[in-house]
């Protein structure tokens, strides 16, 4: 094949190669940029500068090399369009810092930072742990900071990410109220910092305030909605990124649904109940409390992280026809209460037949051997007989 | 201990180079930055540049690139910063020291150098 | 270039009186460094990364600070303390010096 004269040549199906002295001072319009995997650039000193613009369209890039080039700054988010890289050399460079933003998101196999004028500040902190994690073959390198030492002996006991404190309202909060939260961020050498209201949707309108090292946030005419949903707030600085996540307690009376009986393994009269602060329970049947027993018991579905509402079951042990009747669930907190009744019927009582129809039936006595605890059927010699355990 | 022992004080006119040196003592030279850092009459501090003497990898302060070299000799231990194109401002006392990057500071300083620019 | 300013430039001061010297980075740092220079002599290294004392230091000098503010405390002035001190910040190069204080003899 004859020699290639372009600045960059194909290299393999679906690689490039830059490796003309100076023919390079960005990555704008590179041939076939859409199907590369592999970028390998060398000897581009004017090549000085890597942003976000330079990568786009590069989207199944896998292997970036740029080495012995004049780079000196990649943008915190120079690989926002190259999410599939997972090697990067950019060695013998001019780069003195490299921001933990622009590996964030990553899924980096090998970083390779060797020969560059590095320099030591709690913004390398998130680099000198890689090292000693042993991320990114970074340990092999010993990487050192230019005029001062190895990156393994660089002090961190400074480079903290912020520290966030979100002060949330000591009293109850009720729906249409309005709420102020402020979070107070603290910490050297903050960046940005903001408010992740993505779980919020219709439960309070928003308004932001303020800014580093206070920020202020109004959630105003809250409905309940809002219980269960994260409030975060966030900081960044040159080592790394804090949040810190609050819920706000809306106030809201109890409620509750009963819904028709369904056998499953054991019989369940299915419920929901709502309400902030969770409401207390208690079971009705046929107008009386009911006491939970092994054989009788409310069990709870696991709750939705997002959501106040509780699914559950009063569970029934294999009811009979004595457990047939009208079940009431009552449930109560601090703002109101509420109830629900449901009829269930489980087993027709086999004593409610016609005295003309004259059907021989005995009783059993229960097992005294059976371990089980519960009721044993027994075969009976009369071939029409009706044997019938009463729990 | 360790100790660095500067050369003696030096007059220079106008427009003339002047080498400086630095002889390193009880550490191994090759593993720690040198840095050169000057003081003019009555005035703060100010920061020139360093060497590595392992592989003689430099880095200057932007305001004296051009006309600061720094070298090293191992055989001797011994660190050399030159300064070319000599002018009346450059009169100042010049400072070696180490960047002792165990506990992360500049640690031990030469006595200083002497230099006067006067025509 | 990161700025560093001292303040005061100078103060008199009496033996054992309680002194701080303050130094501001025109950005935010990651640590700080304290020096003692004595007329005709050579920087003499007090406290490195914000806070720690230098060999054979005194522990009537301490550091603080963070961000852009810094501190040093010399809690009982003596004698053998008269002399100008500076700060240093090597977040980002060059590394910079303060101005320098001169703490003199009231």
């Known amino acids: 094949a004859a020699p290639c004269p372009d600045a960059c040549c194909p290299h393999g199906s679906s690689g490039l190669r830059c490796t003309r002295d100076g023919a390079l001072d960005s990555l704008h319009h590179l041939p076939g940029a859409e199907n590369l995997t592999e970028l390998y650039i060398e000897n581009q000193q004017h090549l000085q500068h890597l942003e976000l613009r330079d990568l786009r369209g590069l989207g199944e890039l896998r292997n970036l090399t740029i080495v012995k080039s004049g780079l000196r700054f990649v943008a915190p988010d120079a690989f926002h369009f190259t999410p599939r890289l997972s090697r990067l050399n950019l060695s013998f460079n001019a780069l003195e810092s490299l921001s933990w933003k622009t590996v964030q998101g990553l899924s980096l196999q090998e970083l390779v930072l060797s020969g560059n004028p590095l320099h030591c500040s709690c913004a390398l902190r998130w680099l000198q742990r890689w090292e000693e994690e042993g991320l990114g073959g970074v340990p092999e390198q010993k990487l050192q900071c230019h005029g001062q030492g190895p990156l393994a002996h660089m002090p961190n006991a400074s480079c903290g990410v912020p520290t966030l404190k979100v002060q949330v309202p000591n009293a109850s909060v009720d729906v249409g109220d309005d709420v102020l939260l402020r979070c107070q961020v603290e910490g050297r050498g903050l960046e940005q910092a903001g408010w992740i209201l993505t779980e919020l949707e219709q439960s309070a309108t928003v308004m932001k305030s303020g800014g580093l090292p206070s920020l202020g946030l109004t959630l105003a005419n809250v409905t309940s909605d809002l219980n269960r949903k994260n409030v975060t707030c966030w900081a960044e600085n040159d080592v790394g990124r804090a949040e810190v996540s609050v819920q706000v307690n809306v106030s809201f009376p109890a409620s509750v649904q009963l819904h028709t009986a369904v056998e499953m393994h054991h019989w369940c009269i299915p419920f929901s109940v709502d309400g902030q602060p969770a409401p207390s329970l208690r079971w009705l049947f046929n107008g009386s409390v009911l006491n939970e027993t092994s054989f009788i018991f409310t069990e709870f579905l696991e709750p939705a992280a997002n959501e106040t509402v509780r699914h559950g079951c009063l569970r029934l042990n294999q009811p009979t026809h004595v457990n047939n009747g009208n079940y009431t669930l009552l449930a109560a907190n601090p703002f109101g209460q509420a109830s629900a009744s449901i009829m269930a019927a489980f087993m027709d009582n086999p004593f409610e037949f016609n005295p003309e129809d004259p059907i021989p039936v005995s009783f059993s006595p229960v097992d005294t051997n059976s371990t089980s605890g519960d009721p044993v059927e027994k075969k009976d010699e009369t071939p029409f007989g009706v044997s019938v355990a009463v729990g | 201990q360790v100790q660095l022992v500067q050369s003696g004080a030096e007059v220079k006119k106008p427009g003339a180079s002047v080498k400086v040196s630095c002889k390193a003592s009880g550490y191994t030279f090759t593993t720690y930055w040198m840095h050169w850092v000057r003081q003019a009459p009555g005035q703060g501090l100010e920061w020139i540049g360093t060497i590595y003497p392992g592989n003689s990898d430099t880095s200057l302060a932007q305001k004296f690139q051009g006309r600061v070299t720094l070298t090293r000799d191992t055989s001797t231990s011994t660190a050399y910063m030159e300064l070319s194109s000599l002018r009346s401002e450059d009169t100042a006392v010049y400072y070696c020291?180490?960047?002792?990057?165990?506990?992360?500071?500049?640690?031990?300083w030469g006595q200083g150098t002497t230099v006067t620019v006067s025509s | 270039d990161i700025q560093m300013t001292q303040s005061p430039s100078s103060l008199s001061a009496s033996v054992g009186d309680r002194v701080t010297i303050t130094c501001r980075a025109s950005?935010?740092?990651?640590?700080l460094y304290w020096f003692q220079q004595k007329p005709g002599k050579a920087p003499k290294p007090l406290i490195y990364y914000t806070s720690s004392l230098g060999s054979g230091v005194p522990s009537r000098f301490s550091g603080s600070g963070s961000g852009t503010d810094y501190t040093l405390t010399i809690s009982s002035l003596q004698p053998e303390d008269f002399a100008t001190y500076y700060c240093q910040q090597w977040h980002s190069y060059p590394p910079t010096f303060g101005g320098g204080t001169k703490v003199e003899i009231k």
């Open positions: 950005s935010s740092i990651s640590w």
């Open positions: 020291t180490r960047f002792y990057f165990e506990d992360w500071y500049f640690d031990v």
